[in-house]
């Protein structure tokens, strides 16, 4: 199997952004977890949220309120998440890891662009 | 490289106050929620208090509700918890830690001692 | 407030032995559970969170498992280094608590 995401994701200011994550499997292939953290040069990684198959969606605190599961009907197999109201300072890089049976772990990183409209006056 | 140093321990007498400080570096400070734990002498981990990313909240464990506050300034990286009416039962060596929703890096611990 | 416990409170085992270490939570913790290691005069370190997700740096010798209320931490092959006390704590309620701690002594 392999993730499917994108490179960059752009969204307008306090738009959703939608971080797309899909495990396309082989028949039988069962996600486990899907765990979504920022990850910065030199920072390590900050936990945004946890999907898990039996427990549901968990949100760390930093981001509780913000991450949310896009709307059903859902596949097994996706882990996309939206991050609410997109602020210039969550544009940056975005991992999701993926857990899988019995493959074993999948990673992928995208990009989140954050554009401020600027408007003119004349 | 993500450091946690803390300052501020001390003997004081019971009743009296304490400012703790912590000074992060290495990370973006002003993204993450932060916490102090403490550690009495020769006993177990304890949850005292935790602070938002922004400052605007904050909650204390049972046992020092009232008596302990909890800040942050994002401009300088430091962290501040100011402790008053101190009891015997509040020595310890008190740890800032940084939420990652469980606690990913831990300061060195400053020991605070309440004796008269 | 949800109560963490863990055993044996101390564990006394032979340098390259298995030691296996329980926690117990009061209620579901789900998969929120940490693990971290405390050697004397030092901060705690973390282990493992996400039940058995290892952190940057943790030797495979380290290994977690359970979910729910019932968890275990396996130190396989015990070093010199692994000598100390383990804590678990979780991390799905507030207030976050931890276990008493277990001791991991040579034997």
């Known amino acids: 199997g392999e993730l499917e995401t994108s490179d960059v994701v752009t969204v307008v200011l306090g738009q959703d952004a939608k971080l797309p994550c899909f495990y396309r499997g082989d028949s039988g292939e069962q996600v486990g977890q899907v765990a979504w953290a920022r990850v910065d040069a030199g920072e390590g990684a900050q936990e945004l949220a946890l999907l898990h198959s039996k427990y549901g969606l968990h949100v760390s605190p930093a981001y509780e309120g913000r991450v949310e599961q896009p709307p059903p009907p859902r596949n097994p197999l996706d882990g996309s998440v939206l991050l609410r109201n997109a602020v210039q300072a969550d544009e940056g890089e975005y991992e999701c890891r993926v857990s899988t049976f019995p493959a074993g772990s999948f990673q992928a990183r995208l990009r989140l662009r954050v554009l401020v409209h600027h408007h003119h006056h004349h | 490289e993500v450091q946690l140093v803390e300052s501020g321990g001390g003997l004081v007498q019971p009743g009296g106050s304490l400012r703790l400080s912590c000074a992060a570096s290495?990370?973006?400070?002003?993204?993450?929620?932060m916490h102090w734990v403490r550690q009495a002498p020769g006993k177990g981990l304890v949850w005292v208090s935790r602070?938002?990313?922004?400052?605007?909240?904050?909650n204390y464990a049972d046992s020092v509700k009232g008596r302990f506050t909890f800040s942050r300034d994002n401009a300088k990286n430091t962290l501040y918890l100011q402790m008053n009416s101190l009891r015997a039962e509040d020595t310890a060596v008190y740890f800032c830690?940084?939420?990652?929703?469980?606690?990913?890096?831990w300061g060195q611990g400053t020991l605070v001692t309440v004796s008269s | 407030e949800i109560v963490m416990t863990q055993s044996p409170a101390t564990l006394p085992v032979s340098p390259g032995e298995r030691a296996t270490l329980s926690c117990r939570a009061s209620?579901?913790?789900?998969?929120?559970l940490a693990w971290y290691q405390q050697k004397p005069g030092q901060a705690p370190r973390l282990l493992i969170y996400?039940?058995?997700t290892r952190a940057t740096g943790i030797p495979a010798r380290f290994s977690g498992s359970g979910s729910g209320t019932e968890f275990t931490l396996t130190i396989s092959g015990l070093q010199s280094e692994d000598f100390a006390v383990y804590y678990c704590?979780?991390?799905?309620?507030?207030?976050?608590?931890f276990g008493q701690g277990t001791k991991v002594e040579i034997k």
């Open positions: 602070i938002n990313s922004d400052g605007s909240s904050s």
């Open positions: 290495g990370f973006t400070f002003s993204r993450y929620w």
């Open positions: 996400g039940v058995s």
């Open positions: 704590q979780q991390y799905n309620n507030w207030p976050r608590t």
């Open positions: 830690v940084r939420d990652n929703w469980y606690f990913d890096y």
């Open positions: 209620q579901s913790v789900s998969i929120n």
